[in-house]
Interface confidence: low
């Protein structure tokens, strides 16, 4: 699997985990058909993917959620891919928004985010949503990952 | 296009094909602006992408469909990216779900799936949907592919 | 960041820009948390990504838009990823379609497109939408990029 000793493959794919925490940051686990290529990328505190090497990464997330317009706030469901680099403030890399469904009890929708970004050593990426209680955790519905170019 | 004789590029992108079959597995073709890098990835029986080399692959699918809430079942439209490895059962890698539209005669929606997965030699990936008759086959609407990291 | 002198990394990620132009081609800028690896990929006229080297590229776009069924045409909102190669006609690589929301004043939705394509030297890719006035330009909502395999 190695590109060479100095240039190993770096990739991760983690699976959503339901959480009783009220935080808007989604929780992830190395379970099911997950990928963790080596220790150059790690899942920290079940919430963020942290990389050890600087470089360009394709980072992606998929979030499936079930919501209803009447039972939700006026604001749409938003998923955000965020970056925290050492010594810097958090920043939003990508966002997607879907208006709540009129289906009852709730209508499922899926969001996919992905893009190429430069990450510094020790940089972490994580996923925020407006309402984590609406996220679907069935097999394959919600996942998060990256690969180093 | 070669990374080297021992490490050639492996990638595919195939285009949806309407089918009279009643199976939930989508059909694909090497037509239009398709990609098939070499014989280390092949489209088998018009339904699955099969790889000859073990490794990490970014696998993706996009499905556009047109459905109406009244004319469809209560269940949402679900697209699943599935894996079949030699001597093993199918596994669901990724799923996305969208509730049917209230638009008439039907409302179009697009789903995108993508993630990094380890594939064994001879492994095949394919796409399942809840109702293939609802899938849109116009240029560019529905496609399926992979690339080896 | 180099794979080697003969094989440098080539990647771009650009950010949407509101435009007063009536064209259906979206406008992009090197702003915010953008990526432009080197001069082997360039953003031309704020509208297209142009590559200097032949090869396989993973190309993606994300478009978030806000629309209302009553205020919009009957046709859905469509985003298209298009290719213009030197001396050839434009062609559609990928499309996604979403029916307009019934939410008022408008309902937000996000579309993601992505696929692997062979590009020739001087080839350009760009993104078309049915109604650019409906596109959301808030941080992270709409972006466009590619990476060379």
């Amino acid at each position: 699997m190695q590109k060479g000793d100095q240039n190993p493959q770096i990739a991760a794919h983690v699976i959503s985990e339901a959480s009783s925490k009220t935080t808007s940051v989604l929780q992830w686990a190395e379970k099911g058909y997950y990928t963790m290529s080596n220790n150059l990328v790690t899942l920290e505190n079940g919430k963020q993917l942290t990389v050890k090497r600087q470089g360009l990464y394709y980072i992606y997330a998929q979030v499936t959620f079930c919501s209803n317009r009447e039972a939700s706030s006026q604001a749409p469901f938003i998923a955000s891919l965020c970056l925290k680099s050492p010594g810097r403030f958090e920043r939003i890399l990508l966002r997607a928004a879907n208006t709540h469904s009129s289906a009852k009890p709730c209508g499922q929708q899926s969001i996919h985010l992905g893009g190429v970004f430069e990450l510094q050593p020790g940089a972490s990426v994580f996923v925020n949503v407006t309402d984590p209680s609406q996220v679907s955790h069935g097999t394959g519905f919600t996942s998060f990952g990256l690969l180093k170019l | 296009m070669q990374k080297g004789d021992q490490n050639p590029q492996i990638a595919a992108h195939v285009i949806s094909e309407a089918s009279s079959k009643t199976t939930s597995v989508l059909q694909w073709a090497e037509k239009g602006y398709y990609t098939m890098s070499n014989n280390l990835v092949t489209l088998e029986n018009g339904k699955q992408l099969t790889v000859k080399r073990q490794g990490l692959y970014y696998i993706y699918a996009q499905v556009t469909f047109c459905s109406n809430r009244e004319a469809s079942s209560q269940a949402p439209f679900i697209a699943s990216l599935c894996l079949k490895s030699p001597g093993r059962f199918e596994r669901i890698l990724l799923r996305a779900a969208n509730t049917h539209s209230s638009a008439k005669p039907c409302g179009q929606q697009s789903i995108h799936l993508g993630g990094v997965f380890e594939l064994q030699p001879g492994a095949s990936v394919f796409v399942n949907v809840t109702d293939p008759s609802q899938v849109s086959h116009g240029t560019g609407f529905t496609s399926f592919g992979l690339l080896k990291l | 960041m180099q794979k080697g002198d003969q094989n440098p990394q080539i990647a771009a990620h650009v950010i949407s820009e509101a435009s007063s132009k009536t064209t259906s081609v979206l406008q992009w800028a090197e702003k915010g948390y953008y990526t432009m690896s080197n001069n082997l990929v360039t953003l031309e006229n704020g509208k297209q990504l142009t590559v200097k080297r032949q090869g396989l590229y993973y190309i993606y776009a994300q478009v978030t838009f806000c629309s209302n069924r009553e205020a919009s045409s009957q046709a859905p909102f469509i985003a298209s990823l298009c290719l213009k190669s030197p001396g050839r006609f434009e062609r559609i690589l990928l499309r996604a379609a979403n029916t307009h929301s019934s939410a008022k004043p408008c309902g937000q939705q996000s579309i993601h497109l992505g696929g692997v394509f062979e590009l020739q030297p001087g080839a350009s890719v760009f993104v078309n939408v049915t109604d650019p006035s409906q596109v959301s330009h808030g941080t992270g909502f709409t972006s466009f990029g590619l990476l060379k395999l």
Epitope: I15, A29, E30, K31, G32, Y33, Y34, T35, M36, G138, T139 | R88, R91, F117, E118, L119, Q120 | -
Partner: nanobody
Framework: EVQLVESGGGLVQPGGSLRLSCAAS????????MGWFRQAPGKEREEVAT????????YYADSVKGRFTISADNSKNTAYLQMNSLKPEDTAVYYC?????????WGQGTLVTVSS
Amino acid sequence: EVQLVESGGGLVQPGGSLRLSCAASGRTFSSYYMGWFRQAPGKEREEVATFYTGDGRTYYADSVKGRFTISADNSKNTAYLQMNSLKPEDTAVYYCAAWLNGGNRWGQGTLVTVSS
């Protein structure tokens, strides 16, 4: 790292029953694909029965449907394969497997012999 240890194999007459157990240590089964494979002499290893502990979906090879039942006790980190109406062609080494990180982690196997 998950370690898997199978038990319960042995010699049984055609039409008889056996219950195989697979004890896991090092990590819980939570939300993994767990499965039983078998390999008969001179044949390829084949998947016999598998389930996804996250939502309880099960899969069975056509050759064992209606005769074999897969189950688990998450509190004991143990998976089971109840094998009824055994046939001589079920003779094989049976392996427990946990599906992790893109590949199976295997137990050492337990021999099941169906013979009169």
